[in-house]
């Protein structure tokens, strides 16, 4: 059974992940981002189901495509380079989902824009955090 200290650690990691995803979303939605229209043409894949930490596998698998799209944006829209930002997220995701689990992600049929994709994972983080508090 999870201890209070492990629950607290998970909560902090989820809060960190949430902040990173929100920062990316804010950078993209920034009114000074002239690339938004173009960035919305890129397709992202969403999980059929995202209710548990193991489902973060679906986020991990889309991090590389996310980095490629972020590379197109003006770097001043973000505090970190896309490579460093995605690397940080990857570390948190690996810790949260556990590297020993071999969960096969199932994806929904319809694709999502970068904004929809980020909003979906922001909602996921908020939902899990609310169950922990």
């Amino acid at each position: 059974a999870p201890t209070s200290s492990s629950t607290k650690k998970t909560q902090l990691q989820l809060e960190h992940l949430l902040l990173d995803l929100q920062m990316i979303l804010n950078g993209i939605n920034n009114y000074k981002n002239p690339k938004l229209t173009r960035m919305l043409t890129f397709k992202f894949y969403m999980p059929k189901k995202a209710t548990e930490l193991k489902h973060l596998q679906c986020l991990e698998e889309e991090l590389k495509p996310l980095e490629e799209v972020l590379n197109l944006a003006q770097s001043k829209n973000f505090h970190l380079r896309p490579r460093d930002l995605i690397s940080n997220i990857n570390v948190i995701v690996l810790e949260l989902k556990g590297s020993e689990t071999t969960f096969m992600c199932e994806y929904a049929d319809e694709t999502a824009t970068i904004v929809e994709f980020l909003n979906r994972w922001i909602t996921f983080c908020q939902s899990i955090i609310s169950t922990l508090t």
Epitope: R38, F44, K64, P65, E67, E68, Y107
Partner: antibody, heavy 121, light 113 residues
Framework: QVQLVQSGAEVKKPGSSVKVSCKAS????????IHWVRQAPGQGLEWMGW????????AYAQKFQGRVTLTADTSTSTAYMELSSLRSEDTAVYYC??????????????WGQGTLVTVSS | DIVMTQSPDSLAVSLGERATINCKSS????????????LAWYQQKPGQPPKLLIY???TGQSGVPDRFSGSGSGTDFTLTISSLQAEDVAVYYC?????????FGAGTKVEIK
């Protein structure tokens, strides 16, 4: 039809810089990224970086970071690649290339004819 | 960076015979979300720039003869020339177009036996 026409061959001294141009026609230069790829004599292909001519955003291969500068002039539909602190190992044919789609990692469907840069003392 | 390893280095095939080139990547090029493999093949003849033949591992580029086909998934890929023609003598390169930096194999030289 899409065409990328590059500047002519260059002979440069070690330590100097070279600037190669790539003039795009048959499409709007601001609609796609322009990549630069080099090929040393008898060797394979090596990606150097890309530029989005629309706003000048660039991405470089780690190996060339700080030594290569990619720029574009939308008024003349021309992209430029400048490589500084030249050494003999930089002797190569330099290609500009355009992908099929507006995507940083889409494969390269259109290529310039190549510019041979020879670095020799 | 993803390392691309091609084999063989060179290949001599009789006219009309099948030529097979292999390419191995140091990590998977399969994007699970769309089940596409981000692998391209190019042909380069002496004094010319490379020419895109295939992308997404098996999608033929417009205008490329259908004797050229690509297959494979994950980390192992193959380019097949079903019936070698004299004009197919060239160096063939694989390239991953999955992540930055895009990386190429060292090339396979195809000659006529």
């Amino acid at each position: 039809q899409v065409q990328l026409v590059q500047s002519g061959a260059e002979v440069k001294k070690p330590g100097s810089s070279v600037k190669v141009s790539c003039k795009a026609s048959g499409y709007s230069i601001t609609d796609y990224l322009i990549h630069w790829v080099r090929q040393a004599p008898g060797q394979g292909l090596e990606w150097m970086g890309w530029i989005d001519p629309e706003d000048g955003v660039t991405a470089y291969a780690q190996k060339f970071q700080g030594r290569v500068t990619l720029t574009a002039d939308t008024s003349t539909s021309t992209a430029y690649m400048e490589l500084s602190s030249l050494r003999s190992e930089d002797t190569a044919v330099y290609y500009c290339a355009r992908s099929l789609d507006y995507d940083p990692i889409y494969p390269f469907a259109y290529w310039g004819q190549g510019t041979l840069v020879t670095v020799s003392s | 960076d993803i390392v691309m390893t091609q084999s063989p280095d060179s290949l001599a095939v009789s006219l009309g015979e099948r030529a097979t080139i292999n390419c191995k990547s140091s990590q998977s090029l399969l994007r699970n979300g769309n089940q596409k493999n981000y692998l391209a093949w190019y042909q380069q003849k002496p004094g010319q720039p490379p020419k895109l033949l295939i992308y997404y591992a098996s999608t033929g580029q417009s205008g490329v003869p259908d004797r050229f086909s690509g297959s494979g998934s994950g980390t192992d890929f193959t380019l097949t020339i079903s019936s070698l023609q004299a004009e197919d003598v060239a160096v063939y390169y694989c390239q991953q177009h999955y992540v930055t930096p895009p990386t190429f194999g060292a090339g396979t030289k195809v000659e006529i036996k």
